[in-house]
């Protein structure tokens, strides 16, 4: 079971001091009140990769 | 079979305390976050507190922050309601009850509720 | 916090009616949504969660729906042991967790 600041939770996610572990970001679209949505950028990662510059 | 036992109601006169406690059973208790709801004679549910799988994080319904305190004991599956500075509208059956495992979803075991009585 | 209201506050009915129960929100809280059963000197009882799934064990005359601020849990065909008190609770403004001032259905 991680801990806060030990390793971070893995891209896309967030710790939940709440639930003791990482949750997806992506549901802080719908319920943004979650405390692990603190942890999260403002702005959700790109569907996919540029192919170019 | 999952079990919540409540303990530790009566009847206490204002400005008093009590310590309620929830021995849990029958599922591993320490991975579940852990909620405090009460009811009114008569009345509906109310949600009093909420504690995480680990005891570090805590919250409370701004009726009772600052008097209550919500507690576990991961180790003896039990979890504990500190109620201090008590109040005749603290007066309620007090149910304890076991959090889905995602986030504040729903509570999907109650124990079966202690009764709190305030009065002189 | 988010106030949950529930309509009728209570209802007259038979068995093997159909009944529906509805909850409103003050505010949208997607389907964060969930509903319960109460009988006299009991503890309440999880039906359905995130407003249509029906909690494990739970008989299938009972139904949700709803998203946003409008709900609806149905009794497809009302059973004794169905005569209760219902209650909506959301779960969207956490940790202000609501639930609605119930709903007793009792026999005609």
């Known amino acids: 079971e991680q801990a806060p600041g030990t390793a971070p939770c893995s891209h896309g996610s967030s710790w939940s001091a709440d639930l003791d572990k990482c949750m997806d970001c992506a549901s802080c679209r719908a319920r943004p009140h979650s405390d692990f949505c603190l942890g999260c950028s403002a702005a959700p990662p790109a569907p996919f990769r540029l192919l170019w510059p | 079979e999952v079990q919540l036992l409540e303990s530790g109601g009566g009847l206490v006169q204002p400005g008093g305390s009590l310590r309620l406690s929830c021995a849990a059973s029958?599922?591993?208790?320490?991975?579940?976050?852990m909620m405090w709801v009460r009811q009114a004679p008569g009345k509906g549910l109310e949600w009093v507190s909420y504690?995480?799988?680990?005891?570090?994080?805590?919250h409370y319904a701004d009726s009772v922050k600052g008097r209550f305190t919500i507690s576990r004991d991961n180790s003896k599956n039990t979890l504990y309601l500190q109620m201090n500075s008590l109040r005749a509208e603290d007066t309620a059956v007090y149910y304890c009850a076991r959090g889905g495992d995602t986030y504040f979803d729903y509570f999907d075991y109650w124990g079966q509720g202690t009764l709190v009585t305030v009065s002189s | 916090d988010i106030q949950m209201t529930q309509s009728p506050s209570s209802l007259s009915a038979s068995v093997g009616d159909r009944v529906t129960i509805t909850c409103r929100a003050s505010q949208s809280i997607s389907s964060y949504l969930n509903w319960y059963q109460q009988k006299p000197g009991k503890a309440p009882k999880l039906l359905i969660y995130a407003a249509s799934s029906l909690q494990s064990g739970v008989p299938s005359r009972f139904s949700g729906s709803g998203s946003g601020t409008d709900f609806t849990l149905t009794i497809s065909s009302l059973q004794p042991e169905d005569f209760a008190t219902y209650y909506c609770q959301q779960s969207y403004s956490t940790p202000g967790i609501t639930f609605g001032q119930g709903t007793k259905v009792e026999i005609k």
């Open positions: 504690i995480s799988p680990s005891g570090g994080s805590t």
């Open positions: 029958g599922f591993t208790f320490s991975p579940y976050p």
